[in-house]
């Protein structure tokens, strides 16, 4: 029962985690304009992995996609790759883990096969979670580096006359979503791996049948089974089914002149 619970919980936690990784990857707020100790503007900038957006105090929001591949920073490309790999591995892991769930009966699938599938999905979830955490951390590191660089050069003189204020960016909501989601996927993966150990069928223990002949004690061992020297009852190899199968199942918003958003 504990194995089923661990496996089921691992699946649910991973499912939530992967949904979070997908959400984080799609979110526009990976980096947001730093408003602290900065000249306050009537325009708020934020950026995602796929597009950058500007929200005016008028309510008008304009998002522009990054329509270039070669012109983008290598780090951004790396983060994109890590997140996509995380999503793909997580999705495959979810697919595998559905068939591995102990509460779902598929044909005459052996426990050993379910155990292997549980382990495989667990490892996939762990790698998926690590990819997401790594991707988000690389982006966060990039932000921190750029933040301090722009702070150092915050006011750059233009001909000694005019000051231009550089926009500084800080952590956006997507980073926190990504970290939490990656962590959940990782935890789910670990739980699947733990469940796998409980699923793996141990070699059956049968009591040795002793025939006492004159003076000699000979133990006859039924073929194909390992003899046990102990006489304790073996309950570890019982198959438990808890009922039938269960299924788990460049944008712009315009405020009209007459209808303010």
């Amino acid at each position: 029962m504990a194995v089923t619970a661990c496996q089921g919980l691992g699946f649910v936690v991973s499912l939530i985690g992967i949904a979070g990784i997908i959400a984080a990857t799609c979110m526009d707020q990976w980096s947001t304009q730093d408003l602290y100790n900065n000249p306050v503007t009537a325009v708020f900038n934020y950026q995602g992995l796929w597009r950058s957006c500007v929200r005016e105090s008028s309510g008008f929001t304009e998002c522009r996609g990054y329509f270039t591949l070669l012109g983008l920073p290598a780090m951004l490309q790396a983060v994109r790759a890590l997140m996509i790999v995380g999503i793909v591995l997580g999705a495959i892991g979810l697919l595998v883990s559905i068939f591995a769930l102990k509460c779902i009966r598929i044909g005459s699938m052996e426990d050993s096969a379910k155990a292997n599938m549980t382990l495989t999905s667990g490892i996939m979830f762990i790698v998926s979670g690590l990819c997401a955490i790594a991707g988000v951390s690389v982006f966060a590191n990039m932000l921190v580096t750029n933040f301090w660089m722009s702070t150092a050069n915050m006011y750059t003189g233009m001909g000694g006359m005019v000051q231009t204020v550089q926009t500084r960016y800080t952590f956006g909501a997507a980073l926190f979503v990504g970290w939490v989601a990656g962590g959940l996927t990782l935890i789910g993966g670990v739980m699947m791996c733990i469940a796998c150990r409980g699923l793996a069928p141990e070699e059956t223990n049968y009591k040795a049948v002793s025939y006492h002949a004159s003076g000699h004690s000979v133990a006859y061992k039924p073929g194909g089974f390992k003899a046990s020297t102990g006489f304790g009852s073996n309950t570890k190899n019982k198959k438990i089914y808890d009922g039938g199968a269960r299924t788990e199942d460049e944008v712009q918003s315009y405020p009209s002149k007459h209808d303010y958003v």
Epitope: T41, A42, N45, Q47, E56, S58, R64, K257
Partner: antibody
């Protein structure tokens, strides 16, 4: 038709306060409404803004201690109250609705406030 | 605060003449996020509230005659009236719509000779 209709002219004594209203009609009352002051023969000066959605306001530091912007959602009306009036506060006060580029597309007709003893 | 400096303070031109009004800001009004300049031009006639002409430094408001055009980026901006008409007599204001407090220029008074 979009309209911002302001209250009528006022004559007030120095040290007193004045409350100017701005009633919006013809559009959904959900975005920032700004207040702008124009002294006789002078340029325009931004006083502050209020968001009818959440009643949050931002004020120009110059007026911060004396100005209060409030609203009445039931009548789609924004109010601007200026206290401790001085003779130099004699001006036309405009309310304006925000538009693309944070520009002011719709303006009230203006309210002349005369501070005189 | 951002200082908006308009020049000239006033000018008198003949009907049909091309006129250029200037506006300079003490800081760049260009937003890197969308590459738009947050500068607005208004026309104000005596006894009336200002009227929106141009926003984002060069986008003409609907209903504004196409003889009005805005240009410039960063800190230097221009409002051009390609052929001045009698009804263009007014004070023209530029406004910083990027930094708080939102500031206006002193205005340029346009008259007909």
């Amino acid at each position: 038709q979009v309209q911002l209709v302001q209250s009528g002219a006022e004559v007030v004594k120095p040290g007193a306060s004045v409350k100017v209203s701005c009633k919006a009609s013809g559009y959904t009352f959900t975005n920032w409404v700004h207040w702008v002051i124009q002294a006789p023969g002078q340029g325009l000066e931004w006083m502050g803004e209020i968001n009818p959605t959440n009643a949050r306001s931002n004020y120009n530091e110059k007026f911060k201690k004396r100005v209060t912007m409030t609203l009445d959602r039931s009548t789609s009306t924004v109010y601007m109250e200026l206290s401790s009036l001085r003779s130099e506060d004699t001006a036309v006060y405009f309310c304006a609705g925000i538009y693309y580029g944070n520009s002011f597309a719709h303006w009230g007709q203006g309210t002349l406030v005369t501070v005189s003893s | 605060d951002i200082v908006m400096t308009q020049s000239p303070d006033s000018l008198a031109v003949s009907l049909g003449e091309r006129v250029t009004l200037n506006c300079k800001s003490s800081q760049s009004l260009l937003n890197a996020g969308n590459q738009k300049n947050y500068l607005t031009w208004y026309q104000q006639k005596p006894g009336q509230p200002p009227k929106l002409l141009i926003y984002w430094s060069s986008t003409r408001e609907s209903g504004v005659p196409d003889r009005f055009s805005g240009s410039g980026s960063g800190t230097d901006f221009t409002l051009t009236i390609s052929s001045v008409q009698a009804e263009d007599v007014a004070v023209y204001h530029c406004q910083n719509n990027y930094y708080y407090p939102l500031t206006f220029g002193g205005g340029t008074k346009l008259e007909i000779k």
